[in-house]
């Protein structure tokens, strides 16, 4: 007996790791046996070379060759997402549409977010080598190498957190050249080599000498970003100071720094960072768009000298280095609601003054943009006709608009009755795909 098509096996999300073809499965029942066609982001696929897709007789889709690891177009950020694939099974009694399956490709960018820096540590004290691995998909794992060999991590003495290496108690044998290595299925990347010097603690019989040291912090200068640290490095400053008093009793110098609070406000706690220098040194890990106070403190072993004077420096704002998160589109009564969550705080690069929202061309909205001022994280757009509505959102600081979110789309059906929401075992679909062809 004749029956309409029904999807029995839906395609599954997968990561293309190559070098062989990726396969997307789709099986359907129906009488007469249905014909299968595949769509990518709602558009039918050609399957004829030079198309990178090939259809097998059983309805399986072969992706013969992915794009070069990660792809970008129209000036957008590198993407790992090849798109959402759906299959359609059709016979003369109707058409069934599968759930969408997202295909992504393994990527590992070149640029480290934070490169490890040369440093001086003291025997018995803890020190940290910072490393922010390059962005990658899947998330890269981080390992450390010392003097060209993998570092054997000793529990209780070594901890790797977020890529950074924390050494609980420095020993003379820890001296050497360290490198951070990020690895995922797309390959591996090596950081710059950082030189770690270990000094013996010096016990002064008269630590009172340290109290007589006077430190004049003379300059705090914003450094030009190191190109090796990639396109969005955290800011670093160069501190210069002069020491007077007893003959060089200080064994090391520590920078103390904090963000400046509003006048009369409770001061923020001072952060401390051991400096690799005796008259000048680099201090990193700061944030754009902040006003900082800096001072320097001398120390010898456990003894500390008096703090220097305080210098202020305003770091300029930059555009946000991450897009707004969780962008969603929801249908309203003759309107579409766009909502989002601000980018992570560490990517603000200043004060977020508002948001820019774009509608993309070739959908039911003409290309347009709106500015949302202040802390508001939603926008209502009037709609006049059914069709696809696609938007992108970017956060704005005093330096301009930052990285835009990936396009998010919503299909409004006839008479604005409802938005197409394809059920799945994971609840409704994310609204990231254009589903103009998913009408029953």
């Amino acid at each position: 007996q004749d029956s309409p098509p029904q999807i029995l096996v839906h395609p599954q999300d997968q990561l293309f790791q190559g070098p062989g073809p990726a396969r997307m499965s789709c099986q359907a029942s129906g009488q007469p046996p249905p014909t299968i066609r595949w769509l990518l982001n709602g558009q039918p696929l050609s399957m004829v070379p030079p198309d990178p897709h090939h259809l097998l007789p059983d309805g399986t889709l072969l992706l013969l060759q992915p794009p070069a690891r990660g792809h970008a177009h129209d000036g957008q950020a590198l993407s790992t997402d090849l798109g959402v694939y759906t299959c359609e099974a059709s016979n003369r009694l109707g058409t069934a549409v599968s759930r969408g399956a997202r295909l992504s490709v393994a990527v590992l960018r070149e640029d480290f977010q934070i490169q490890p820096r040369d440093m001086v540590a003291v025997v018995g004290e803890q020190f940290t080598l910072e490393c922010g691995p390059p962005w990658g998909h899947p998330e890269p794992t981080v390992s450390w190498w010392k003097d060209g060999k993998p570092l054997a991590l000793q529990p209780g003495r070594h901890t790797v957190s977020g890529g950074s290496l924390l050494m609980a108690r420095a020993e003379k044998s820890d001296e050497g050249t360290y490198m951070c290595v990020a690895t995922n299925s797309a390959g591996h990347r090596e950081s710059r080599a950082a030189r770690v010097s270990i000094q013996e603690p010096q016990d002064y019989t008269e630590p009172v000498e340290l109290l007589a040291v006077r430190i004049q912090l003379e300059n705090v200068t914003l450094l030009n970003p190191d190109p090796a640290e990639g396109p969005k490095p955290r800011p670093a400053v160069w501190l210069s100071w002069k020491v007077s008093g007893p003959a060089a009793p200080a064994q090391s110098y520590t920078a103390l720094f904090r963000t400046q609070t509003a006048p009369g406000g409770q001061g923020a706690p001072w952060a401390e960072e051991l400096l690799a220098g005796w008259q000048s040194a680099e201090l990193g890990g700061l944030h754009w768009g902040q006003d900082y106070e800096f001072k320097v403190r001398p120390s010898s072993g456990r003894a500390r000298g008096p703090d220097s004077n305080v210098l202020l420096l305003r770091l300029p704002e930059k555009v946000p280095s991450a897009p707004p998160q969780e962008v969603t589109l929801k249908p309203g009564n003759g309107t579409v609601f766009v909502s989002w969550v601000p980018p992570p705080a560490e990517n603000h690069n200043g004060i977020i003054r508002g948001y820019q929202v774009w509608s993309l061309g070739n959908t039911s909205l003409p290309p347009a943009n709106w500015t949302v001022v202040g802390e508001q994280t939603q926008l209502e757009i009037a709609t006049h006709m059914p069709g696809s509505y696609c938007v992108q959102v970017a956060a704005v600081t005093g330096a301009g608009a930052g990285e835009p979110s990936r396009p998010v789309c919503l299909l409004l059906e006839q008479a604005m009755e409802r938005a197409t929401q394809e059920p799945s075992e994971h609840g409704p679909w994310t609204l990231e795909q254009l589903r103009a062809t998913l009408k029953r």
């Epitope: 558009q43 050609s46 004829v48 030079p50 198309d51 070739n362």
Partner: antibody
């Protein structure tokens, strides 16, 4: 910098042969299709042939089938168009172009073009 | 073979004008359509592929739309450097075919 450079054009008599070369640099040659496209003087663009650097798959326009042969040497990152039995109507500027696939909205574009090489078939 | 028909074959416009060129395929080609710009004596330059995605480095005043058989290239505000000939091309099936071209001239 991604670049394609054609060479080998010139004046040839009807019935004669020429071999055009297209040297690619700045990208992974085997990951892309290369097309030859020609343009007769004062006319529009006409696709001639395509080859896939990865596996050597080829396709031809009916107007050149049996007379032209496309090939590639991946070790030299170079594509070739061997043109035999040339006719007056083959006179044109011949371009080689790299074909890229767009993933957000499926389809191809010839995103990198050579400067073109003129082939004149005349007695 | 899939025939690609462009209209108009030529048009005159002024700097700042909004210009629309259409391309019709003789059968459905999904989004497998590209647009090129060509200036005299130069190789063509890719503007749009996948019907609506701008190629790298192409100004945002160029946009493409359409799917199936009917496609449009729009230049939102014509600039002096935009006077050229524009071609559409399908890659849905062999033979790959181009439209006959649209020449955009200064009024």
């Amino acid at each position: 910098e991604v670049q394609l450079v054609e060479s080998g054009g010139g004046l040839v008599q009807p019935g004669g042969s020429l071999r055009l070369s297209c040297a690619a640099s700045g990208y992974t040659f085997s990951s892309y299709w290369i097309s030859w496209v020609r343009q007769a003087p004062g006319k529009g663009l006409e696709w001639v042939s395509t080859i896939y650097g990865y596996d050597g798959s080829t396709n031809y326009a009916d107007s050149v089938k049996g007379r032209f042969t496309i090939s590639a040497d991946t070790s030299k990152n170079t594509a070739y168009l061997q043109m035999n039995s040339l006719r007056a109507e083959d006179t044109a500027v011949y371009y080689c172009a790299r074909m890229s696939y767009n993933w957000s909205s499926p389809g191809h574009g010839m995103d990198v073009w050579g400067q073109g090489t003129l082939v004149t078939v005349s007695s | 073979d899939i025939q690609m028909t462009q209209s108009p074959s030529s048009l005159s416009a002024s700097v700042g004008d909004r210009v629309t060129i259409t391309c019709r395929a003789s059968q459905s080609i999904s989004s497998y359509l590209a647009w090129y710009q060509q200036k005299p004596g130069k190789a063509p330059k890719l503007l749009i592929y996948g019907a609506s995605s701008r190629a790298s480095g192409v100004p945002s005043r160029f946009s493409g739309s359409g799917s199936g058989t009917d496609f449009t290239l729009t230049i939102s505000s014509l600039q002096p450097e935009d006077f050229a000939t524009y071609y559409c091309q399908q890659s849905w099936s062999y033979p790959l075919t181009f439209g006959q071209g649209t020449k955009v001239e200064i009024k």
